[in-house]
Interface confidence: low
C-alpha cells in the first residue's frame, strides 16, 4: 500500500525565524527517510545534528529530529524530508518540504556579491533568474541595471519570488550587463551584483568606408576603414587580405565603440604608406564570429600621375 507522506513538525510551506536562534525540525514517517538541506547547511557542520528514533504507537514509525544551532542567514532555503526508495511504493521518493527564512537585518540577501559581481550566463528568449533571494519574505527588493535603469516586476515578464529572486521569463539584450538587486533595511542600503553574459554570433553589417573602386596616386597613403556592427556582447575577429600580404605591407589598427546602447561597432583600419603598383588589386575585410562569417571588398587602382 502507498505510504503516507512524511510529516514535518513545522506546518505550512514556509517558516520565518531569526538568525541566531536554534532551528528544531522533526520528520515523522512510515519508513526510513533522509534530509535534503540548503547547500550551506553541510551535514558535517558542527552546528547541525540529526538524531533518529523510533516513534509513534508501538514505536513503529520512523522519526528524525534536525537541530541547527545558531542558524545563519545563509542557511535560508528548502528543508525537506524524503523517504528512501521503498520497493512497495510505486513513487520512488515521497517527500515533505518547508522553506525556512532565517531573517537577519544585517544581511537581507542570502548570497551577497557586493564587491565582485557573480556571472550569470543567459540566452536571449529564455528564462533568466537574477538569484538575489532574501532572508525574509517581507523585504522589498529593487532590480536596477547599470547605469540608470530600473526593471519593474509586472507579474508577467518579470516576477519577484523571495525564494528565488527576479525571474525574467523572456530575456532580451536589455538584460545584458551589470544588474544590481537593492534592499533598504533599517535605513541601510544593501546591494548584490550580477553580471549577465551572453555570447552571440550575429554579425549585423560589415562595410568598408570606400566601397567603390579606390583611385590613388603612386606614393600616396592608402587608408581603408572596415566597420562591423554586431549585437551587444558579440565578439568578432576581423582580418584583411590584400595583394602584397606576404610582405606584410599593411599596418592594422583595431578599436571597439561600445557607446551605442544597442550594438557594438568594431573598427579595423588598414594603412599602407607609399603605395606602389604591386599594391593594386582586391582588398577584402573578413569578419568572423564563431560560425558566422561576412566579408566585404573593394578594388584599389594605382595611377602614376594625376589626370584630368
Amino acid at each position: 500500500s502507498k505510504l503516507k507522506d512524511p510529516e514535518l513538525s513545522l506546518k505550512g510551506t514556509q517558516h520565518i525565524m531569526q538568525a541566531g536562534q536554534t532551528l528544531h525540525l522533526q520528520c515523522r514517517g512510515e519508513a526510513a527517510h533522509k534530509w535534503s538541506l540548503p547547500e550551506m547547511v553541510s551535514k558535517e557542520s558542527e552546528r547541525l545534528s540529526i538524531t533518529k528514533s523510533a516513534c509513534g504507537r508501538n514505536g513503529k514509525q520512523f522519526c528524525s529530529t534536525l537541530t541547527l544551532n545558531t542558524a545563519q542567514a545563509n542557511h535560508t532555503g528548502f528543508y525537506s524530508c524524503k523517504y528512501l526508495a521503498v520497493p512497495t511504493s510505486k513513487k520512488k521518493e515521497t517527500e515533505s518540504a518547508i522553506y525556512i527564512f532565517i531573517s537577519d537585518t544585517g544581511r537581507p540577501f542570502v548570497e551577497m556579491y557586493s564587491e565582485i559581481p557573480e556571472i550569470i550566463h543567459m540566452t536571449e528568449g529564455r528564462e533568466l533568474v537574477i538569484p538575489c533571494r532574501v532572508t525574509s519574505p517581507n523585504i522589498t527588493v529593487t532590480l536596477k541595471k547599470f547605469p540608470l535603469d530600473t526593471l519593474i516586476p509586472d507579474g508577467k515578464r518579470i516576477i519577484w519570488d523571495s525564494r528565488k529572486g527576479f525571474i525574467i521569463s523572456n530575456a532580451t539584450y536589455k538584460e545584458i550587463g551589470l544588474l544590481t538587486c537593492e534592499a533598504t533595511v533599517n535605513g541601510h542600503l544593501y546591494k548584490t551584483n550580477y553580471l549577465t553574459h551572453r555570447q552571440t554570433n550575429t554579425i549585423i553589417d560589415v562595410q568598408i568606408s570606400t566601397p567603390r573602386p579606390v583611385k590613388l596616386l603612386r606614393g600616396h597613403t592608402l587608408v581603408l576603414n572596415c566597420t562591423a556592427t554586431t549585437p551587444l556582447n558579440t565578439r568578432v575577429q576581423m582580418t584583411w587580405s590584400y595583394p602584397d600580404e606576404k610582405n606584410k605591407r599593411a599596418s592594422v589598427r583595431r578599436r571597439i565603440d561600445q557607446s551605442n546602447s544597442h550594438a557594438n561597432i568594431f573598427y579595423s583600419v588598414l594603412t599602407i604608406d607609399k603605395m606602389q603598383n604591386k599594391d593594386k588589386g582586391l582588398y577584402t575585410c573578413r569578419v568572423r564570429s564563431g560560425p558566422s562569417f561576412k566579408s566585404v571588398n573593394t578594388s584599389v587602382h594605382i595611377y602614376d600621375k594625376a589626370f584630368i
Partner: antibody, heavy 125, light 108 residues
Framework: ELQLVESGGGLVQPGGSLRLSCAAS????????ASWVRQAPGKGLEWVSA????????YYAESVKGRFTIFRDNSKNTLYLQMNSLRAEDTAVYYC??????????????????WGQGTLVTVSS | SYELTQPLSVSVALRQAAKITCGGN??????AQWYQQKPGQAPVLVIY???RRPSGIPERFSGSKSGNTATLTISRAQAGDEADYYC???????????FGGGTKLTVL
C-alpha cells in the same frame, strides 16, 4: 569534452627557437582569453604570457618580453607561443590555460579553469 | 615587480582545518585565485574571485581575503588534499598575472 593539448616542445640549443601550439576542443575557443604558464623542474608556477579572446591584446612577463610572442588562430582553435633567443632558464614544462568566463575582460580576472597537460621545453647545449 | 608571499609548507592532521596564506602589498584591490597541483599533473582551479568555488570542487575548500592577505582554508583535510597550492592575482598596474611561490600541504 573540453581539452587543451600542447605540442612543439623538445630539446633546443641556447639562442635557438621553438614554436609551441595548444589545440583547443570542446568549447568555443574564441570566447575566452588564454595564457601560457611554465614550471621549471622542481619549481613553482610562473606566468609567461596571456592573450585576449580576439588576439588584439597581449601581455608578457618581464622575463620573456621581446623574446616570446603569443598569438592565436581562432579559425583553427589554436593558441601559439613563438619562443626566440631561448636561454637555459627557459627550461620548463609549458602549460596552456583557458581563462574562466570574462565577459568584461578589463574589469574582472577570474583565473584559468582548464589547463593542458603541458609540453617540456629543454634548452641545453 | 609585484610579489605574492606564501609559506613554503603547511602541515595538518587528518580531518583538521588547514589554512594557507598569501600576502601581497596590494592584494586587497585584486581578485585572488587558488590552484591545487598534484605531482605530475596540471594545476586545478579550486577558488576564484577570492571566495568562489568552481563546480566540482568540494565544499571543504573555501577562500577569504582580509587586508593584504588572502587565505585558502581546507576545513576537513583529507589525504587526497596533499598537493602544492598556489595563489594568483591579476596585477592591473603592470598588466601581469602573478603567482605566489607555492605551499606544500602535508596531511599527517
Amino acid at each position: 569534452e573540453l581539452q587543451l593539448v600542447e605540442s612543439g616542445g623538445g630539446l633546443v640549443q641556447p639562442g635557438g627557437s621553438l614554436r609551441l601550439s595548444c589545440a583547443a576542443s570542446g568549447f568555443t575557443f574564441s570566447d575566452y582569453s588564454a595564457s601560457w604558464v611554465r614550471q621549471a623542474p622542481g619549481k613553482g608556477l610562473e606566468w609567461v604570457s596571456a592573450i585576449s579572446w580576439s588576439g588584439d591584446s597581449t601581455y608578457y612577463a618581464e622575463s620573456v618580453k621581446g623574446r616570446f610572442t603569443i598569438f592565436r588562430d581562432n579559425s583553427k582553435n589554436t593558441l601559439y607561443l613563438q619562443m626566440n633567443s631561448l636561454r637555459a632558464e627557459d627550461t620548463a614544462v609549458y602549460y596552456c590555460a583557458k581563462s574562466w568566463a570574462t565577459p568584461i575582460e578589463s574589469l574582472y580576472y577570474y583565473g584559468s579553469d582548464y589547463w593542458g597537460q603541458g609540453t617540456l621545453v629543454t634548452v641545453s647545449s | 615587480s609585484y610579489e605574492l608571499t606564501q609559506p613554503l609548507s603547511v602541515s595538518v592532521a587528518l580531518r583538521q582545518a588547514a589554512k594557507i596564506t598569501c600576502g601581497g602589498n596590494n592584494i586587497g584591490s585584486q581578485t585572488a585565485q587558488w590552484y591545487q597541483q598534484k605531482p605530475g599533473q596540471a594545476p586545478v582551479l579550486v577558488i576564484y574571485a577570492n571566495n568562489r568555488r568552481p563546480s566540482g570542487i568540494p565544499e571543504r575548500f573555501s577562500g577569504s581575503k582580509s587586508g593584504n592577505t588572502a587565505t585558502l582554508t581546507i576545513s576537513r583535510a583529507q589525504a587526497g588534499d596533499e598537493a602544492d597550492y598556489y595563489c594568483q592575482v591579476w596585477d592591473a598596474s603592470t598588466q601581469a598575472i602573478v603567482f605566489g611561490g607555492g605551499t606544500k600541504l602535508t596531511v599527517l
